[in-house]
């Protein structure tokens, strides 16, 4: 058993049929010595008396809020949560496996630049009685500070018969140099509590590997005289690290109709302009990627050809 | 190796082309190592990230763009020097183009070159003959060093009398290649910045 936060405790259980469970001793936080009784949740049934209560925790029915009282007055609470371990593996029932970039990916993180700010998100089908808490650091043995905000519900989607909820959190490394060469990864730890079930999820990454620039901005077309070709120009996104001559981007320019199966014109360039062939009912799209370290491409920025 | 046929953009900052080749060569070599050593811990997640130049050179700090010198997090051990030297500097005069930066890059390359050559000598003794260093990568390191045109004491190639542990050598190769790729990215960014200055 360990303390998650004040008066909240996590009991780690090997989860299999007829498992013996864990013996837990609860102590009432009071100077009083006698006349103390214990109850669980909203029940008035007295579970025991005395300053300490010993219980055998085997299942979710044994978890919950234990309260010690004296003469009708509440002295203190202890909330017990369960963390299940099945076949030596901690349960991952609360969050959905996003399967990208690989299986067992529950947390996904992205950074728009090298400033040390990043966003992580996760998915669940659970809509109520759900809380998250996020901690992060650079390295684990001698951790350096990363400050994370509160996790918030950022999107709701309908997937078939199910509703899916996306939560996200923003974190910022306390003293980040955009030009630094990372040797210790960022560690992100998410504590998830659904009703009386506790789970924790972790992700470890270098900022350089989760870079995904914002799309290029200010796309403009200039038709070339006596030609089907147009010159398309754009600018670096405002959120990208500066100076741009040090943090350079490379771009992919594509002309395509509405369907992905349609024919297209595609060219890669390090410049902020390119010449392409425009077709009726097609769009010109441009996306960006770090020129020197190939992490993710940005989303497309698009303008119609006509 | 074949002699180059055409020299692109003759006015270009001389080292930019070499640094681009360097990043390409080390990235290819790392990819090859990952594929060939698929049953060894050779991915970024599996290896320990070591920097053989740590406390010996200060490339990131010495080559920091002027715009980032206002960022206190970037100034841990920054020593500024505005002396210009080395053939890559051509005749451009900007305070960023400091000898310290380019000589630090040169020292990095020299250290990695020695490590790679020592390692290759060991890998050539491996009866499995599983992986060797790409000669192109070694040649590109050499070309960039020549373009930087700094003179410094020759570092003797390490020779070891004991029987090499090939498993450890291959893991060390992965560690070295990952670190060198990260340094090559920094070098490329620096050269691109210098070229634009």
């Amino acid at each position: 058993i360990w303390e998650l936060k004040k008066d909240v405790y996590v009991v780690e259980l090997d989860w299999y049929p007829d498992a013996p469970g864990e013996m837990v001793v609860l102590t009432c936080d009071t100077p009083e010595e006698d006349g103390i009784t214990w109850t669980l949740d909203q029940s008035s049934e007295v579970l025991g008396s005395g300053k300490t209560l010993t219980i055998q925790v085997k299942e979710f029915g044994d978890a919950g809020q234990y309260t010690c009282h004296k003469g009708g007055e509440v002295l203190s609470h202890s909330l017990l949560l369960l963390h299940k371990k099945e076949d030596g593996i901690w349960s991952t029932d609360i969050l959905k496996d996003q399967k990208e970039p690989k299986n067992k990916t529950f947390l996904r993180c992205e950074a728009k630049n090298y400033s040390g700010r990043f966003t992580c998100w996760w998915l669940t089908t659970i809509s109520t009685d759900l809380t998250f808490s996020v901690k992060s650091s650079r390295g684990s043995s001698d951790p350096q500070g990363v400050t994370c905000g509160a996790a918030t519900l950022s999107a709701e989607r309908v997937r078939g018969d199910n509703k899916e909820y996306e939560y996200s959190v923003e974190c910022q490394e306390d003293s980040a140099c955009p030009a630094a060469e990372e040797s210790l990864p960022i560690e992100v730890m998410v504590d998830a509590v659904h009703k009386l079930k506790y789970e924790n999820y972790t992700s470890s990454f270098f900022i350089r590997d989760i870079i995904k620039p914002d799309p290029p901005k200010n796309l403009q077309l200039k038709p070339l005289k006596n030609s089907r070709q147009v010159e398309v120009s754009w600018e670096y996104p405002d959120t990208w690290s500066t100076p741009h001559s040090y943090f350079s981007l490379t771009f992919c320019v594509q002309v395509q109709g509405k369907s992905k199966r349609e024919k297209k014109d595609r060219v890669f360039t390090d410049k902020t302009s390119a010449t392409v062939i425009c077709r009726k009912n097609a769009s010109i799209s441009v996306r960006a990627q770090d020129r020197y370290y190939s992490s993710s491409w940005s989303e497309w920025a698009s303008v119609p050809c006509s | 190796r074949n002699l180059p046929v055409a020299t692109p953009d003759p006015g270009m900052f001389p080292c930019l082309h070499h640094s681009q080749n360097l990043l390409r060569a080390v990235s290819n070599m790392l990819q090859k190592a990952r594929q060939t050593l698929e049953f060894y811990p050779c991915t970024s997640e599996e290896i320990d990230h070591e920097d053989i130049t740590k406390d010996k050179t200060s490339t990131v700090e010495a080559c920091l763009p002027l715009e980032l010198t206002k960022n206190e997090s970037c100034l841990n051990s920054r020593e500024t020097s505005f002396i210009t030297n080395g053939s890559c500097l051509a005749s451009r005069k900007t305070s960023f183009m400091m000898a310290l930066c380019l000589s630090s890059i040169y020292e990095d390359l020299k250290m990695y070159q020695v490590e790679f050559k020592t390692m290759n000598a060991k890998l050539l003794m491996d009866p499995k003959r599983q992986i060797f260093l790409d000669q192109n990568m070694l040649a590109v390191i050499d070309e960039l060093m020549q373009a930087l045109n700094f003179n410094s004491e020759t570092v003797p190639q390490k020779s070891s009398l004991e029987e090499p542990d090939f498993y450890k050598t291959k893991i060390k190769l992965c560690i070295l290649l990952h670190a060198f790729r990260i340094r090559a990215v920094t070098i490329d960014r620096v050269m691109s910045y210098l070229n634009a200055s």
């Epitope: 089907r228 070709q229 490379t250 199966r261 349609e262 024919k263 297209k264 014109d265 595609r266 060219v267 890669f268 360039t269 390090d270 010449t275 062939i277 077709r279 009726k280 | 692109p8 953009d9």
Partner: antibody, heavy 118, light 107 residues
């Protein structure tokens, strides 16, 4: 299976014109760009131009501008390349080729040998 | 026009050995570079798109690398069927241009 079948070999006199055809099968004809590339005996590949069969848009290499005409007939899924004012150095194998991507080629025809000789 | 220069023009290789062909552009073309193989009396066949993207159906021993002005086609271990002429082609701008070709011959 996408296939491009070209017309047979031709022998032409200098100053005359030649029209080579290329019939496409497999896939929708207008879903692809069609290119013409030639190869003189023992020489490398030389791009001549492309056509978008959907709208008839064309682009020619400056070297052939004014001498080459590429057309397409959607009803028969056939593209044509006509080269006029032939000279002996136009002796080559002419390939039609196609791709959904405009700037490179993934499927080639078998080639048509055009010999220009007096 | 962008001039593509291949080297060497002839490359004698022992079967089973690796081979590397170089292609250089007269100006920077990013990764807008494609590789083709042509056997005598046959039409060309696409091998690599955009400098390093492999094409389905092409053996994994063929790989491409490079960006900017310098590109390489590598055959990790030459098979008897790989003896042919190889061409690079730039798609950075029109007109599309090819290298002169590199003939890989049996040593």
């Amino acid at each position: 299976q996408v296939q491009l079948v070209q017309s047979g070999a031709e022998v032409k006199k200098p100053g005359s014109s030649v029209k080579v055809s290329c019939k496409a099968s497999g896939g929708t004809f207008s879903d692809y760009y069609l290119h013409w590339v030639r190869q003189a005996p023992g020489q490398g590949l030389e791009w001549m131009g492309w056509i978008d069969p959907e709208n008839g848009d064309t682009e020619y290499a400056p070297k052939f501008q004014g001498r080459v005409t590429i057309t397409a007939d959607e009803s028969t899924s056939t593209a044509y390349m006509e080269l006029s004012s032939l000279r002996s150095e136009d002796t080559a194998v002419y390939y039609c080729a196609r791709n959904k991507e405009l700037r490179y080629i993934d499927v080639w025809g078998q080639g048509t040998l055009v010999t220009v000789s007096s | 026009d962008i001039v593509m220069t291949q080297s060497p023009l002839s490359l004698p290789v022992t079967p089973g050995e690796p081979a590397s062909i170089s292609c250089r552009a007269s100006q920077s073309i990013s990764i807008n570079l494609h590789w083709y193989q042509q056997k005598p009396g046959q039409q060309p066949r696409q091998l690599i798109a955009f400098a390093s993207q492999s094409i389905s159906g092409v053996p994994s021993r063929f790989s491409g690398s490079g960006s900017g002005t310098d590109f390489t086609l590598t055959i990790s271990s030459l098979q008897p069927e790989d003896f042919a002429t190889y061409y690079c082609q730039q798609s950075n701008s029109f007109p599309l241009t090819f290298g002169q070709g590199t003939k890989v011959e049996i040593k």
